[in-house]
């Protein structure tokens, strides 16, 4: 008789999840010499231990502590790029500007990027059918708690000037409910972070408005200023071109007004 299984509103665990995590870990540690000491089997065991046999609506940051310990990594604290609702461009940017890092350029972020996972209470099974949706089911689910934990730690580590890429095409350019707005902003350390510099990425080809004057950006500036961190903002009108110019600023197309 098939056992009754909880039906959640979100998609189930990504297929071949254990194999994917292990393979990503091996690949990452091969590419990054400073992480060569990491034992990927132990990393997988710690990852699995955070959610297997646990109710997927009752996950805590504490559950992920063994994984956090194994994945401890030092990135240059003054080279951190945060992002909100514009992940692909942020990742393209750090591929060009190799001395800057998003969370997904770290081991733990790289392992989990774009994956979904959850288990079931009292069984060692991974649930490939469905996992809790943050809104419809519960916020303390394995995926949300993981990203909250690693995002908090990433923001806490930042120093000097922290950059954040924001999506200027969205109705809320800065969204208080995003991971950036609800976790990272509040975990930047004022004694270490001097400035948060926001880059507002324009979507429209002919959009030359100053989106740094957007009310949600003013709200971000207010939150940051109250935390005794300076705030600056710049518009990036043509992100495709901007990436090219970061790569090669001397290119004549970078210096001619269009």
């Amino acid at each position: 008789v098939p056992r009754w299984r909880q039906q959640w509103s979100g998609p189930g665990t990504t297929k071949r999840f254990p194999e994917t995590v292990l393979a990503r870990c091996v690949k990452y540690t091969e590419i990054h010499p400073e992480m060569r000491h990491v034992d990927c089997q132990s990393v997988w065991d710690a990852f699995k231990g955070a959610f297997i046999s646990k109710h997927p609506c009752n996950i805590t940051e504490e559950d992920y502590q063994p994984l956090m310990k194994l994945g401890t990594q030092t990135v240059p604290c003054n080279k951190i790029l945060l992002w909100s609702r514009i992940k692909d461009l942020a990742h393209q940017f750090t591929q060009v500007q190799r001395d800057m890092f998003t969370l997904e350029d770290t081991l733990l972020g790289y392992l989990a990027d774009d994956l979904t996972w959850c288990g079931e209470f009292n069984t060692s099974k991974i649930n490939y059918q469905s996992c809790p949706d943050w809104r419809k089911d519960c916020s303390n689910n394995p995926v949300s708690v993981f990203w909250k934990t690693v995002s908090r730690r990433f923001a806490e580590a930042a120093c000097d000037v922290v950059h954040v890429m924001l999506n200027g095409s969205r109705s809320k350019i800065f969204d208080k409910n995003s991971t950036f707005g609800s976790v990272e902003v509040h975990n930047l350390q004022p004694e270490k972070v001097q400035t948060l510099e926001a880059w507002v990425i324009h979507g429209g080809r002919e959009d030359s408005r100053d989106l740094c004057q957007d009310p949600t950006i003013k709200e971000l500036e207010s939150i940051i200023s109250k935390r005794n961190i300076q705030f600056s903002c710049k518009n990036i009108y043509r992100p495709d071109k901007f990436l090219q110019c970061v790569k090669n600023p001397e290119d004549s197309s970078c210096t001619s007004e269009i």
Epitope: D99, E197, K234, R238, F242, P249, C254, I258
Partner: nanobody, 126 residues
């Protein structure tokens, strides 16, 4: 906070030279891109010239309209960027603004600079 103080503007005759200076304070600018934009009467502000930070080799870049006539340079010990303007033309008449960015200075149709200085006026008469 970052401050940029531009100086050296003035009135000259066509064909003459001027040298603008911009001093940055509040940070060490050696790794920053620093440079110049200008705004002619009734026109949009435009890129003139910039020099990349030390990490990028301190390389210059120029707008086509000033190539071969203007030279941008920097003195990192003095946190200063210069614009040597030779063979000036009436169409170079504008307010010249110093700018700095942690990454790169590009045409304003691509991206804003991180920081602007106040302007210095250059008038070229024929």
């Amino acid at each position: 906070d970052v401050q940029l103080q531009a100086s050296g503007g003035g009135s000259v005759q066509e064909g003459e030279s001027l040298k603008l200076s911009c001093v940055g304070s509040g940070r060490t600018f050696s790794d920053w891109a620093m440079g110049w934009y200008r705004q002619a009467p009734g026109k949009d502000r435009e890129f003139v010239a910039a020099v990349s930070g030390a990490g990028r080799g301190g390389k210059p870049s120029y707008a086509n309209s000033v190539k071969g006539r203007f030279t941008v340079s920097r003195d990192n010990a003095k946190n200063t960027v210069y614009l040597q303007m030779d063979n000036l033309k009436p169409e170079d008449t504008a307010v010249y603004y110093c700018a700095a960015d942690r990454l790169v200075l590009v045409a304003l149709s691509i991206a804003d600079p991180g920081f602007w200085g106040q302007g210095t006026r250059v008038t070229v008469s024929s």
